[in-house]
């Protein structure tokens, strides 16, 4: 376990070999979750890229947060995708939080502390627990089959995950840098493995 506070993983160039694998202590399927993170890239007007890829043996796009060029954020649960359109692209560090719950299928997507309109996805589904969680690449199969054209070039950090839906107040607290206790992925006690050319550097966001 490593305390990654105020640090970020840096992916300096496009590749299909550089990634970070995160280890999560999941023992049972997820009926809800929240993922929050920071990232910083210049790619958004150039091509799509993977932000957070959670694959199971049954479904490579079990949870996927992806930037789709010309559209905006793509959010996938169990292979089913919805989009959160972004009309104007700016180059700046971005904080995102996204949550999903099985009971209602409701998805929340927050960008820099501001909520997008809620949408619905995969009501009644459960997310598999035996997962390969990858930063820097999009998994087209469990733990692999990467495409360089989907890789992240830039920084990612403060990756935290919960097995429940955070309240709006909690998400606001996280965005503002307040205290929180993630129970699936914890950036302050992170188990991870680096493959390829990935560097750990001080974070560039406040």
């Amino acid at each position: 376990q490593t305390d990654m506070s105020r640090k970020a993983f840096v992916f300096p160039k496009e590749s299909d070999t550089s990634y970070v694998s995160l280890k999560a202590p999941l023992t049972k399927p997820l009926k809800a979750f929240t993922v929050c993170l920071h990232f910083y890239t210049e790619l958004s007007s150039t091509r799509g890229y993977s932000i957070f890829s959670y694959a199971t043996k049954r479904q490579d796009n079990e949870i996927l947060i992806f930037w789709s060029k010309d559209i905006g954020y793509s959010f996938t649960v169990g292979g089913s995708e919805i989009l959160f359109e972004v009309p104007e692209v700016t180059v700046a560090p971005v904080h995102i939080c996204t949550s999903w719950e099985s009971a209602s299928g409701i998805v929340e997507f927050w960008v820099d502390g501001k909520p997008r309109v809620r949408k619905s996805l995969k009501k009644g589904y459960t997310v598999g627990a035996e997962a390969s969680i990858i930063l820097g690449q999009e998994q087209d199969s469990f733990g692999g089959n990467f495409e360089g054209s989907q890789s992240l070039v830039g920084d990612i950090g403060n990756v935290n995950m919960w097995d429940f839906v955070l309240s709006p107040d909690e998400i606001n607290t996280i965005y503002l840098g307040g205290p929180f206790s993630p129970n699936v992925l914890n950036w302050r006690a992170l188990k991870y493995e680096v493959q390829g050319e990935v560097f750990t550097k001080p974070q560039l966001w406040p």
Partner: nanobody
């Protein structure tokens, strides 16, 4: 094995209409959002439109919004793209895709040529 087979392309005059179809097999079609992308004569890939798995949400690129309509029939495992008020710049090979992250041709595509 995932298979996507597009059809319905052809030669059409500016201002005309066409309806493209994409027959899907090898996966549970109703579980997936589906997209149309196109490859222009200069080989650029452009996203055109996306429809969510349950027909709940549709999304369009600025260049086709108001002229194209994406739809699907989950019972027939088929995706559609109704194209109207076609312009010469709509000339392209049109591909259907299972996910917007699959931003590269996965199938044969169908050629649409808009010319007087």
């Amino acid at each position: 094995e995932v298979k996507l087979l597009e059809s319905g392309g052809g030669l059409v005059k500016p201002g005309g209409s066409l309806k493209l179809s994409c027959a899907a097999s090898g996966f549970t079609f109703s579980d997936y959002g589906m997209s149309w992308i196109r490859q222009t004569p200069d080989k650029r890939l452009e996203w055109v439109a996306t429809i969510s798995s349950g027909n709940t949400y549709t999304y369009y690129s600025k260049s086709v919004k108001g002229r194209f309509t994406i739809s699907r029939d989950n019972a027939k495992n088929t995706l559609y793209l109704q194209m109207s008020s076609l312009k010469s710049e709509d000339t392209a090979i049109y591909y259907c895709s299972r996910h917007t992250s699959d931003y590269y041709p996965l199938s044969q595509g169908t050629l649409v040529t808009v010319s007087a």
